[in-house]
């Protein structure tokens, strides 16, 4: 997260760290007791490493009573996701067992009504992604509030030049932005999961290259079918 600040510890109990061989790779969001939603491209970066999900964490390194690392029973990328595009960049991870719920571990309600968030709405994005252009990684969860950007502006030639489909949404990126390592994490508007950080190799913090988020409401049928 660029231009953000440290989050209040455990105030986002849905927040997950998707890890490979014990290292944070991507963000994720607990959407059901045994399921974490993330970004499909995160799996590509995992190669053949052991994928696990950390829940109940604020610090990645320090011991915390609520922290627990779960093995992944099943990884289900969206069937239409492709390495060369950010379309359908969603991944569902089934945990080896149901998460132990509590004040620091709780699923987040996700948007099912397929309607765009009003431009200008302030939404919260959180993650353990880099906090500087130099690539510094934080130990503790960071967050930032970002205004939603209308799709027409996001589709301008100097922005994303028509690449933003109806299944995506954008948020402003003027110095405050999600960045590398935040992919798969939640964009939360009014206490509801609206978007998932896409995992393209986008420049961060440049206002002409807004953050791109996969709209979960557009994938309600797929999410329901996998969770069923």
């Amino acid at each position: 997260i660029l231009g953000g600040r440290e989050a209040e510890a455990h105030a986002r109990p849905y927040m997950a760290s998707v890890q490979v061989n014990g290292e944070h790779l991507c963000g994720g969001v607990l959407v059901a007791e045994q399921w974490v939603l993330s970004a499909a491209h995160c799996l590509e970066d995992a190669a053949d490493g052991k994928v696990q999900v950390l829940l109940g964490a604020h610090s990645l390194s320090q011991p915390e009573p609520s922290k627990r690392l779960y093995d992944v029973l099943r990884a289900v990328p969206h069937p239409d996701s492709r390495p060369d595009t950010i379309d359908h960049d969603l991944l569902l991870l089934q945990l080896s067992e149901k998460a132990t719920l509590g004040p620091a571990v709780r699923p987040l309600p996700w948007q099912r009504v397929d309607r765009d968030v009003e431009p200008g709405t302030l939404c919260d994005v959180a993650g353990w992604g880099i906090v500087s252009h130099a690539g510094r990684r934080p130990d503790r969860l960071q967050h930032v509030l970002l205004p939603v950007l209308d799709r027409a502006t996001c589709n301008r030639r100097t922005h994303h030049d028509g690449a933003i489909t109806q299944r995506m949404m954008c948020a402003e990126s003027n110095r405050r932005d999600s960045c590398k390592g935040d992919s798969g994490g939640p964009l939360v508007c009014g206490g509801v999961l609206e978007g998932v950080v896409t995992s393209g190799s986008r420049v961060c913090g440049n206002r002409k290259k807004p953050g791109i988020y996969t709209r979960v409401a557009s994938y309600a049928a797929w999410i329901d079918s996998v969770l069923a």
Epitope: R151, A152, R157, A163, Q166, N206
Partner: antibody, heavy 116, light 112 residues
Framework: EVQLQQSGPELVKPGASVKISCKAS????????KNWMRQRHGESLEWIGD????????SYNQKFRGKATLTVDKSSSTAFMELRSLTSEDSAVYYC?????????WGQGTLVTVSA | DVLMTQTPLSLPVSLGDQASISCRSN???????????LEWYLQKPGQSPNLLIY???NRFSGVPDRFSGSGSGTDFTLRISRVEAEDLGVYYC?????????FGGGTKLEIK
């Protein structure tokens, strides 16, 4: 299939105004800016301005400020350009184009002829 | 405004020949975001312009690979490796990096 259908040719008298339209189909109208260009006979293209169909925000080429006014009607997925105080210099083909990707989609053009 | 100057004005070619069109801007058209929004359009007689190349060298979908774009800064070139009859028309370069966006004066590709 993305289509931009422009209104038909106009023959107008000097000093009058004209309003030409550009109806979009095959995509969600509010997802892309609409741009307008002018092309006088045998000449190159000039950018007039653009409009965000979500909120009506406009940007104009200084050269066309006071000459062109851009508007949209979201309910009919139509963009409009009004040209006022017309002179023979305004006789041209006027194009609308969707921005994104680039100007990949153009209307067929509307010929405006200013003549007494 | 950024002035885009195309040369030549007219380019007579034989079918199967290579054709090159030059486009120069009077200032750099690198955008503040680092990208260069230089595009090429072909306008056939009585038709609207068609996008060929965007961001200097990227072919738009459906554009044959005989079309290629190159250049940087202020100096850009469109090349057609083997001219076909359907390629005839007026070619325009365009810069979208600075407001107002501007087009070149056009180059007419015609049969020799």
């Amino acid at each position: 299939e993305v289509q931009l259908q422009q209104s038909g040719p106009e023959l107008v008298k000097p000093g009058a105004s004209v309003k030409i339209s550009c109806k979009a189909s095959g995509y969600t109208f509010t997802d892309y800016y609409k741009n307008w260009m002018r092309q006088r006979h045998g000449e190159s293209l000039e950018w007039i301005g653009d409009i965000n169909p979500n909120n009506g925000d406009t940007s104009y080429n200084q050269k066309f400020r006071g000459k062109a006014t851009l508007t949209v009607d979201k309910s009919s997925s139509t963009a409009f350009m009004e040209l006022r105080s017309l002179t023979s210099e305004d006789s041209a083909v006027y194009y609308c184009a969707r921005e994104g990707p680039s100007f990949a989609y153009w209307g067929q053009g509307t010929l405006v002829t200013v003549s007494a | 405004d950024v002035l885009m100057t195309q040369t030549p004005l007219s380019l007579p070619v034989s079918l199967g020949d290579q054709a090159s069109i030059s486009c120069r801007s009077n200032q750099t058209i690198v955008h503040s975001n680092g990208d260069t929004y230089l595009e090429w359009y072909l306008q056939k007689p009585g038709q609207s312009p068609n996008l060929l190349i965007y961001k200097v060298s990227n072919r738009f979908s459906g554009v044959p690979d005989r079309f290629s774009g190159s250049g940087s800064g202020t100096d850009f070139t469109l090349r057609i490796s083997r001219v076909e009859a359907e390629d005839l028309g007026v070619y325009y370069c365009f810069q979208g990096s600075h407001v107002p966006p501007t087009f070149g004066g056009g180059t007419k590709l015609e049969i020799k």
